[in-house]
Interface confidence: low
Amino acid sequence: EAHKSEIAHRYNDLGEQHFKGLVLIAFSQYLQKCSYDEHAKLVQEVTDFAKTCVADESAANCDKSLHTLFGDKLCAIPNLRENYGELADCCTKQEPERNECFLQHKDDNPSLPPFERPEAEAMCTSFKENPTTFMGHYLHEVARRHPYFYAPELLYYAEQYNEILTQCCAEADKESCLTPKLDGVKEKALVSSVRQRMKCSSMQKFGERAFKAWAVARLSQTFPNADFAEITKLATDLTKVNKECCHGDLLECADDRAELAKYMCENQATISSKLQTCCDKPLLKKAHCLSEVEHDTMPADLPAIAADFVEDQEVCKNYAEAKDVFLGTFLYEYSRRHPDYSVSLLLRLAKKYEATLEKCCAEANPPACYGTVLAEFQPLVEEPKNLVKTNCDLYEKLGEYGFQNAILVRYTQKAPQVSTPTLVEAARNLGRVGTKCCTLPEDQRLPCVEDYLSAILNRVCLLHEKTPVSEHVTKCCSGSLVERRPCFSALTVDETYVPKEFKAETFTFHSDICTLPEKEKQIKKQTALAELVKHKPKATAEQLKTVMDDFAQFLDTCCKAADKDTCFSTEGPNLVTRCKDALA
């Protein structure tokens, strides 16, 4: 139904707390350099205005669209051009072009310092003094670093953060209570961020149809007892929610997500038997829980997929009459039978099936032509299965850090032109797939591994788009989203690369490395490893292991020495010489 005042409608639907949180996220994602205080002031002004409209929907400007209202606020910020450069040009445009312009200026890798967590005592003090401001800072800091973070889900993580602080700040040993819990939330939030970014990339690059196909596959796996009409309805709604969030329409997105959760809980009988525990929770927890609910038990008597999609004499007729519906039912039927496949794999199979029908239905004897299509799926299925086995075996042998290093070497050889920080970030993220997925039961490994890798590689593509330096990466990133991971896996050593000359300063370290946290130490060592590979792209695994072991030994010795500085300045050059010799 149409509302006289959109802003009043959303304020009423969402309530003041969520309304303010979402407006803060929206502003922080658009203008990523502004301070919390600047944004908090704008949020308060928007909220006061919304309340005016709730009181009187006919009041001045209450009938304006949210984009107009928010855009006008952003464009009124002083020193916009000085701080944001050409983003200020967006303000010369009219809606909807102005919002599109803001979206195009979102920066996936803003030059902001890492979000440092204060020590426990200080955190608890500021949390107790003003919980609302504390959580506002959290929303602001995460949103500006992750401009496509799924807004309603960020509210959920803020709520988790709040609950952890409430619990741990009452304990005697705040630090040991907070650290593991907040680390857990951070890890989950970072994964959520890359997954959502992948969804927005799918929407931006390939449109709603591509996203809807992803949703049909994913929902069919999770709800194999829901009928195709139900899955289509859920996929349509989910597509709308994600389109809104990716497009910066965060109030609409959160409102529609709440509606979708309500619908699912009211229609459990026709969706899944596993929803009840989610549906008993309050809104943010309910929607989060539904988004990762376990798969329902598959119907016992599903007929073989071949019956309707290969053996049926009407295949070409059904395909010609309604291509999208027929392919949709294929994707639905195949996905509900294969919760053990990744969504990426299911979409590749659907694409292969479509290509086969396109070719065969134009021939004299279509059934003879498409009769072998299911057998032709085999290599497409085997490839990711082998990838999972090989990589999980390697992870089990090396552990997370060693596995990250193996991936770092592999990817530096594939794309040595890519900047070392990007390679290290990618390898560390790709390496976490082991910890995240390889410990799962066999039937859950493939979907976990491949869909996570796809999301991480999407980030690699986004960062590379800013400064394209590798033809290998450009080639893999230009194709379809579902082909990216196989494309990256198939890359070999880049033969066109001219090795970097050996610079001693790249491998010169100082005693300050000794006091760094373990994670930072690892990053320093991994940076050196990537630089070594760039110097000698064809170095063997043994050579690299020798050098890295020597390096680790050097750090251990010097960090234990009484006079660390002297040790680093005398042993360092010896290490560099030994490295050069080992790689010669």
Partner: nanobody, 124 residues
């Protein structure tokens, strides 16, 4: 406007087969924007979904796992009606049986049309 007219016996003996029909007007049983369900309600079990059928370039049928072996739902396109057959009934199957059409529309999502319900008692 969609209307569902149910018919069938009110009393069935144990071990016999219960048969109900649901005549549809205002929509087609083979239309591609609806799904046709049977649901029952009893004091002991509450509201219970039994199964559904719908057409999307072929017929799909789904049953509640607990009734899989005893239940058959069919659509008759020539009569534009839905039928339910539940075999080997016991007093536990005593309930009000509803025929429910779920209609999917692009924007507003789904809305349901319910039949008036048939009270079925299983007793000798």
């Amino acid at each position: 406007q969609v209307q569902l007219q149910q018919s069938g016996p009110g009393l069935v003996k144990p071990s016999q087969t219960l048969s109900l029909t649901c005549a549809i007007s205002g929509d087609s049983v083979s239309g591609n924007s609806a799904a046709w369900n049977w649901i029952r309600q009893s004091p002991s079990r509450g509201l219970e979904w039994l199964g559904r059928t719908y057409y999307r370039s072929k017929w799909y049928i789904g049953y509640a796992a607990s009734l899989q072996s005893r239940l058959a739902i069919n659509a008759d396109t020539s009569k534009n009606q839905l039928s339910l057959r539940l075999s080997s009934v016991t007093p536990e199957d005593t309930a009000v049986y509803y025929c429910v059409g779920r209609h999917y529309s692009g924007h507003s999502g789904a809305f349901d049309t319910w039949g008036h319900g048939t009270m079925v008692t299983v007793s000798s």
